[in-house]
């Protein structure tokens, strides 16, 4: 009966620009590859936090290489969100601060932050994987410097420059690199196969977490869990997605299950993920 | 097996309101895995995406804003159905109208299609 | 908008052909990609879903690939049946948006 009182609460997107969460390839170093050719590309340098020229050898590379300046600001750099670095004591909120959490239309279950204009701070949910909008954050500390107010009534920018409130000057801090990387199994996913109470047979799937496959099962025809399917297929799709990496917009991209160490070349580091 | 089985008039006059309702059998319209879609399809604009609804807990809707002043969807939970109104009709709104379930952007189920001709 | 743009627009081939169809997203999408088939008077069908996964019931000669801006349907040996118009869509962002189509028509 909750779904009855809701039925006319609609919660509705407002004109804003799309989401735009930084891409993690933006932290890639500028890489010319190994051919040859002289060819002109632009990169965001994350020391810089610019997008700037360089040559491209024509051949393989990284993802975080552009034909157009242009490109590179619209993929690399938070100025269409709003996200800017701070020159004013008192800034107002980006709009999208105000907008209701938004866990979007996929089937994910990923921890996320948005900023509750009802609280005044910063709260998690959980965010489907796809979609959604732009108040949505990875990290409580990148909601709270980006929607809340800080102890002296002025706001931090969202690369973790803070704005001095004695002398107005901006104090860099560490760059983070984002983690490539993640696992997001829907927490369904993990539950056993629930016949649930009532008296019918129907034929259902759900997802086998001990031996990692889809699986038949007889449905009662009401209750059980969200492990329940009506299609293999859709039950694949919902839980078998092994290791996820996340690459744009808070998005999520299927990576294939090797049994070798995948290497991934970043700034700062290197880091080594082992697929399961 | 998911259907949905779609309804309304064909023929609307300009300045008017067009109205379409899809019925759901084999899903819920408050499932909290699935987004219900209209799309429309005309030779001039090709597949268009007008807007969707989506229970997580709540209702959310998303519209697309080349209609997003003159476009209302709803849910109707008692009778497991959802429909389109679409305000201020012009004969550029003429078009084939379909409803669909989406489970993660994936449009994998539709409905049967409606030809709305906007015609005084 | 995120603008999908398919090439070709349309294509005449022959029974046992191999068949490949692009579309390009106007920025990046990463996987967040579905191919769609249309024949005359019908409703769309889902073929493929998140760049490469075939749709339930859907034969194996159709594949997809690619990552990004840039995408690729192949059919491997084109069938009597699969003369119909070809849509991709994105879901990285709103609107949902499709490609304006690729028509294979029979040489």
């Known amino acids: 009966d909750s779904e009855e009182d809701e039925e006319h609460t609609i919660i509705t997107d407002t004109e804003l620009p799309p989401l735009k969460l930084m891409h993690s390839f933006c932290a890639f170093k500028a890489d010319d590859g190994p051919c040859k050719a002289i060819m002109k590309r632009f990169f965001f340098n994350i020391f810089t936090r610019q997008c700037e020229e360089f040559i491209y050898g024509g051949c393989e590379g990284n993802q975080n290489r552009f034909e157009s300046l242009e490109e590179c600001k619209k993929m690399c750099t938070r100025d269409n969100a709003n996200r800017i670095i701070k020159t004013t004591l008192q800034q107002e909120k980006p709009d999208f601060c105000f907008l209701e959490e938004d866990p979007g239309i996929c089937r994910g279950y990923i921890t996320r932050y948005f900023y509750n204009n009802q609280t005044k701070q910063c709260e998690r949910f959980k965010y489907g994987g796809c979609l959604g909008n732009m108040n949505n954050f990875e990290t409580l500390e990148e909601c709270k410097n980006i929607c809340e107010d800080g102890p002296n009534g002025f706001q931090v920018d969202n690369y973790g420059t803070q704005l001095n409130a004695v002398n107005n000057s901006l104090t860099p801090q560490s760059t983070k690199v984002p983690s490539l990387f993640e696992f997001h199994g829907p927490s369904w996913c993990l539950t056993p196969a629930d016949r649930g109470l009532c008296r019918a047979n129907e034929n259902r799937f759900y997802y086998n977490s001990v031996i990692g496959k889809c699986r038949p099962f007889k449905y009662s025809g009401c209750g059980g869990n969200e492990n329940n399917f009506t299609s293999k297929q859709e039950c694949l799709r919902a839980c078998k997605k092994g290791f996820i990496q996340r690459i744009s917009k808070g998005g999520l991209i299927k990576t294939k299950r090797k049994r070798k160490k995948q290497r991934v070349k970043i700034a700062y580091e290197e880091i080594f993920v082992k697929n399961m | 097996q998911v259907q949905l089985q779609q309804s309304g008039p064909g023929l609307v006059k300009p300045s008017q309101t067009l109205s379409l309702t899809c019925a759901i059998s084999?899903?819920?319209?408050?499932?909290?895995?699935?987004?219900w879609s209209w799309i429309r399809q005309s030779p001039g604009r090709g597949l268009e995406w007008l807007g969707m609804?989506?229970?997580?807990?709540?209702?959310?809707?998303h519209y697309a804003v080349s209609v997003k002043s003159r476009i209302t969807i709803n849910p109707d939970t008692s009778k497991n159905q959802f429909s389109l109104q679409l305000n201020s009709v012009t004969p550029e709104d003429t078009a084939v109208y379909y409803c669909?379930?989406?489970?993660?952007?994936?449009?994998?189920?539709w409905g049967q299609g409606t030809l709305v001709t906007v015609s005084s | 908008d995120i603008q999908m743009t398919q090439s070709p627009s349309s294509l005449s081939a022959s029974v046992g052909d191999r068949v490949t169809i692009t579309c390009r997203a106007s920025?990046?999408?990463?996987?967040?990609l579905n191919w769609y088939q249309q024949k005359p008077g019908k409703a769309p069908k889902l073929l493929i879903y998140?760049?490469?996964n075939l749709q339930s019931g859907v034969p194996s000669r159709f594949s997809g690939s690619g990552s990004g801006t840039d995408f690729t349907l192949t059919i491997s040996s084109l069938q009597p049946e699969d003369f119909a118009v070809y849509y991709c869509?994105?879901?990285?962002?709103?609107?949902?948006?499709f490609g304006q189509g690729t028509k294979v028509e029979i040489k």
């Open positions: 669909a379930r989406g489970g993660s952007g994936v449009m994998d189920v």
């Open positions: 084999g899903d819920s319209v408050s499932s909290s895995s699935a987004a």
């Open positions: 609804i989506y229970y997580r807990s709540k209702w959310y809707n």
């Open positions: 920025q990046s999408i990463t996987n967040y």
């Open positions: 998140d760049v490469s």
């Open positions: 869509q994105q879901y990285s962002g709103y609107p949902l948006t």
